[in-house]
């Protein structure tokens, strides 16, 4: 199973990116550092493309020191970040309103710490179930063109409904290859019989799964990372097959419409 | 070599301040929380708290007001003053690392603090 | 406020014998909790965090898992060395935190 998380300048999950059998589950988060190696083709997360600059103002990257991206996070309140509960570290850094995943200074980011990271409490590591975590930030953020939250939605996703999914993860598998700047990759949410014949026992209601039939999906890195559906936050990048983008085996995301009132009442009890 | 190094003195009196340091080699402070960690003799461990590179710190609900954890700016050392001790702060203290996923992976040898007049 | 009772207080074993250890949180703590092993003298030893993930060089028969409240560490077979005591420690949450660690299981030589 890929967790879509990484670490130190290579997959750095449960199953090292030269370790893990094809065909098995992973999740989606990993390690693009400074000096990670970038893609220069057209092939985007999994063949997604360069997002327009300042579309994706609530899109969050949770550092590791120096400047290593582990997972991707969302900005839902002026204080406080959606990612995914397997993306959890006890030191970490939040950069918002940065384009490239290189560290030079952009004018529009804004950096922060994580005071108080919660995840949700039906999370059980390794698995997949409940997997989502609350950031409480250090301060407010200053809302700019590039710095935003997003609204999560309460509806639940509906099979067909199109989807934007973005990040800066692996833009190949099993090869790691990290992009220059942050990737937009357009999906459709899948039936959750679909989902469930691509990962038989593996799927319930906290999950739902989206993709297409060309070989696009996000990958190690995009972890905790946003899916926006009709310009609100639908889910969150949760795991996947390994390698990425095989046909018939979709990314999986966290289905946040489950999740609302967790969310709001964690975000009251500890504001 | 990754090492802590807890020191300070064996002895404190009743209302006195306990202050010890830990002394960190072999990793940079600036990538670790820290722990501090107490053993009264014969009973179990207690959490004192945690401080992290940013300076943001968490307490043991007991410790808040008398204890405070601190880090000096070259990030070589890591301290603990616990104020208005009794003889129940009589134990061993430890300082540890956390190994970024909620485990502490590298402890000091410790060191015993008794307190008495 | 989230408490660690761990069960039992001891127990008697032999070399060869597998022994499970018992750590109850008070609320759900998710995955995150870790287990040490501590001798006489010395400082603890982590050997489990995440719940069920072995730390760096520990010995493949030590095991755990669990998940929400309940948590088990597990020694399929009791080595000489084993013999010592074994301390539970959430990393949930630090608010409003009287102490992480449970209250410690001693193992001794039945």
């Known amino acids: 199973v890929t967790e879509h998380v990484l670490a130190n300048n290579d997959v750095s999950c449960d199953h090292p990116s030269n370790t893990v059998p094809s065909g098995s589950n992973q999740d989606l988060g990993a390690g693009a550092g400074e000096d990670a190696r970038s893609d220069d083709s057209s092939s985007r997360i999994i063949n997604g493309s360069d997002c327009d600059m300042h579309t994706q103002p609530w899109q969050a990257a949770l550092l590791l020191r120096p400047n290593q991206l582990y997972c991707g996070a969302v900005l839902v309140h002026p204080q406080w970040l959606l990612t995914a509960a397997h993306c959890r570290k006890k030191v970490f850094r939040v950069r918002l309103g940065h384009y490239s995943l290189s560290p030079v200074y952009e004018s529009g980011q804004q950096m922060f710490q994580g005071v108080k990271s919660i995840p949700h409490p039906g999370y059980s590591h390794p698995g997949h179930s409940n997997d989502l975590m609350l950031i409480k930030l250090n301060r407010r953020i200053r809302p700019t063109k590039d710095v935003r939250p997003i609204n999560v939605s309460s509806h639940c996703p509906s099979a067909g409904t199109k989807c934007l999914v973005s990040g800066w993860g692996t833009t190949k598998s099993p090869q790691v290859h990290f992009p220059k700047v942050l990737q937009c990759l357009n999906i459709s949410v899948l039936s959750q019989k679909r989902c469930e014949d691509a990962y038989p026992r593996q799927i319930d209601d906290t999950m739902f799964c989206a993709g297409d039939k060309a070989g696009r999906d996000s990958c190690q890195g995009d972890s905790g990372g946003p899916v926006v559906c009709n310009g609100s936050l639908q889910g969150l990048v949760s795991w996947g097959d390994y390698p990425c983008a095989r046909p018939n085996r979709p990314g999986v995301y966290t289905n946040l419409c489950k999740f609302t009132k967790w969310i709001q009442e964690t975000i009251q009890a500890n504001s | 070599e990754v090492q802590l190094q807890e020191s300070g003195p064996g002895l404190v009196k009743p209302s006195g301040t306990l202050s010890l340091t830990c002394a960190v080699s072999g990793f940079p402070l600036s990538n670790y929380a820290m722990s501090w960690v107490r053993q009264p003799p014969g009973k179990g461990l207690e959490w004192i708290g945690d401080?992290?590179?940013?300076?943001?710190?968490d307490y043991a609900s007991w410790a808040k007001g008398r204890v405070t954890i601190s880090q000096d700016s070259s990030k070589t050392q890591v301290s603990l003053k616990l104020s208005s001790v009794t003889a129940a702060d009589t134990a061993v203290y430890y300082c540890?690392?956390?190994?970024?996923?909620?485990?502490?992976?590298?402890w000091g040898q410790g060191t015993l603090v008794t307190v008495s007049s | 406020a989230i408490d660690m009772t761990q069960s039992p207080s001891s127990l008697s074993a032999s070399v060869g014998d597998r022994v499970t250890i018992t750590c109850q949180a008070s609320q759900s703590i998710s995955s995150w909790l870790a287990w040490y092993q501590q001798k006489p003298g010395k400082a603890p030893k982590l050997l489990i965090y995440?719940?069920?993930t072995l730390a760096s060089g520990v010995p493949s028969r030590f095991s755990g898992s669990g998940s929400g409240t309940d948590f088990t560490l597990t020694i399929s077979s009791l080595q000489p060395e084993d013999f010592a005591t074994y301390y539970c420690?959430?990393?949930?949450?630090?608010?409003?935190?009287?102490?992480?660690f449970g209250g410690g299981t001693k193992v001794e030589i039945k």
């Open positions: 995440l719940a069920s």
């Open positions: 420690q959430q990393g949930y949450t630090n608010s409003n935190i009287i102490n992480t």
């Open positions: 401080i992290y590179p940013s300076d943001i710190i």
């Open positions: 540890a690392r956390d190994n970024n996923d909620y485990g502490l992976d590298i």
